[in-house]
């Protein structure tokens, strides 16, 4: 089953996905799509990177992190209820049936009038750790634990604060991460 993430209408949603490049600058193509990960590609592609850059994106979908270091987490700007659903992050590792795929479920809730709660600083709790297991064909994703009610205000605020900080590695290691090479 998919890992669940939540956001409120009008917020930016954050869907974590990471990989570790085999060597600096040795990037792997990645695609994000709306809908569960099919056998190839990403369903309806909303954003794509190649070996060098983000080479395709649609409005409201962007990468806030340093994708050159493998942070390919997706930010969806100003979400509406229509943004609810499953999203696919696919790491397109070259070779025979090497792709890694992650299904992430985004639940959009109506905006609350109450003030945002205290920010969460327990990064490993805020981002469920993912384990990938190899089998025949693309790897399946299992979760070792998740907090379905985590407030995405906390996550998007933290993501902004941590963009250039040394704590980014903590964040990276607690998301959907694969290592290449």
């Amino acid at each position: 089953s998919e890992v669940e993430y939540r956001a409120e209408v009008g917020q930016n949603a954050y869907l974590p996905c990471f990989y570790t490049p085999a060597a600096p600058g040795n990037l792997v193509p990645v695609c994000w799509g709306k809908g569960a990960c099919p056998v190839f590609e990403c369903g309806n592609v909303v954003l794509r990177t190649d070996e060098r850059d983000v080479n395709y994106w649609t409005s409201r979908y962007w990468l806030n992190g340093d994708f050159r270091k493998g942070d390919v987490s997706l930010t969806i700007e100003n979400v509406t209820l229509a943004d609810s659903g499953i999203y696919c992050c696919r790491i397109q590792i070259p070779g025979i049936m090497n792709d890694e795929k992650f299904n992430l479920k985004l639940v959009i809730k109506p905006a609350k009038v109450t003030p945002a709660p205290t920010r969460q600083r327990d990064f490993t709790a805020a981002f469920p750790r993912m384990l990938t297991t190899r089998g025949h064909g693309p790897a399946e994703t299992q979760t070792l634990g998740s907090l379905p009610d985590i407030n995405l205000t906390q996550i998007s605020t933290l993501a902004n604060e941590l963009r250039d900080s040394r704590l980014a590695n903590d964040l990276r290691d607690s998301g959907a991460t694969i290592r290449i090479g």
Epitope: P38, V39, F40, G43, N44, V45, Q92, G95, I96, M97
Partner: antibody, heavy 122, light 107 residues
């Protein structure tokens, strides 16, 4: 008009090799995944292999991946299937098919070639 | 592997009939399902992709529905040229798999 034309089929002895080709025209070849699908005489359809846009990723039916190799040459708008150690059960019509495009969305083999018959027999 | 099971295996019907063919996947394939029509000696032709989207040039009497594990192909009013074999195929898991086919014959 989209066209896929297979060639290279024929009669081959068990243990032999054959290389199938598929010439594509009428679309931007490098924007699509491509596939080979086969059909044994009087039987149903069986997927064989797929290849991504630039040939860097390939996907196979597990039982065939040690003997078959899919490849492409985007400069020549061509798809290939190298078949080694052929067996009687590989006898089939082999179809080249266009699969999903660069932006996803349409999951189905939208265009097919006319097929080329491979017969493995002594 | 995801198994695709079509029913019925064969079907006799008359011109003008409404015909339904079903396809069941052994696992959730969301909407990654295609339907093909094949006539003897010819290559298959895509009818429906993503479970319900009509392929280019396909008559509107063909329609697809379903998601998850259960899918249906409906021909609202059979025409003489519709007598053929129909296959479903999933694009969700590797390996890609087809149903065993449904042969539609003239009654």
């Amino acid at each position: 008009e989209v066209q896929l034309v297979e060639s290279g089929g024929g009669l081959v002895q068990p243990g032999g090799s054959l290389r199938l080709s598929c010439a594509a025209s009428g679309f931007t070849f490098s924007d699509y995944y491509m596939a080979w699908v086969r059909q044994a005489p009087g039987k149903g359809l069986e997927w064989v292999a797929n290849i991504n846009y630039d040939g860097s990723s390939t996907y196979y039916l597990d039982s065939l991946k040690s003997r078959f190799t899919i490849s492409r040459d985007n400069a020549k708008n061509s798809l290939y299937l190298q078949m080694n150690s052929l067996r009687a059960e590989d006898t089939a019509v082999y179809y080249c098919a266009r699969d999903v495009g660069y932006y996803g969305g349409n999951y189905g083999f939208a265009y097919w070639g006319q097929g080329t018959l491979v017969t493995v027999s002594s | 592997d995801i198994q695709m099971t079509q029913s019925p295996s064969s079907l006799s019907a008359s011109v003008g009939d409404r015909v339904t063919i079903t396809c069941r996947a052994s696992d959730n394939i969301y909407s990654y399902l295609a339907w093909y029509q094949q006539k003897p000696g010819k290559a298959p032709k895509l009818l429906i992709y993503n479970a319900k989207t009509l392929a280019e040039g396909v008559p509107s009497r063909f329609s697809g529905s379903g998601s998850g594990t259960d899918f249906t192909l409906t021909i609202s009013s059979l025409q003489p040229e519709d007598f053929a074999t129909y296959y479903c195929q999933q694009h969700y898991g590797s390996p890609l798999t087809f149903g065993q086919g449904t042969k539609l014959e003239i009654k």
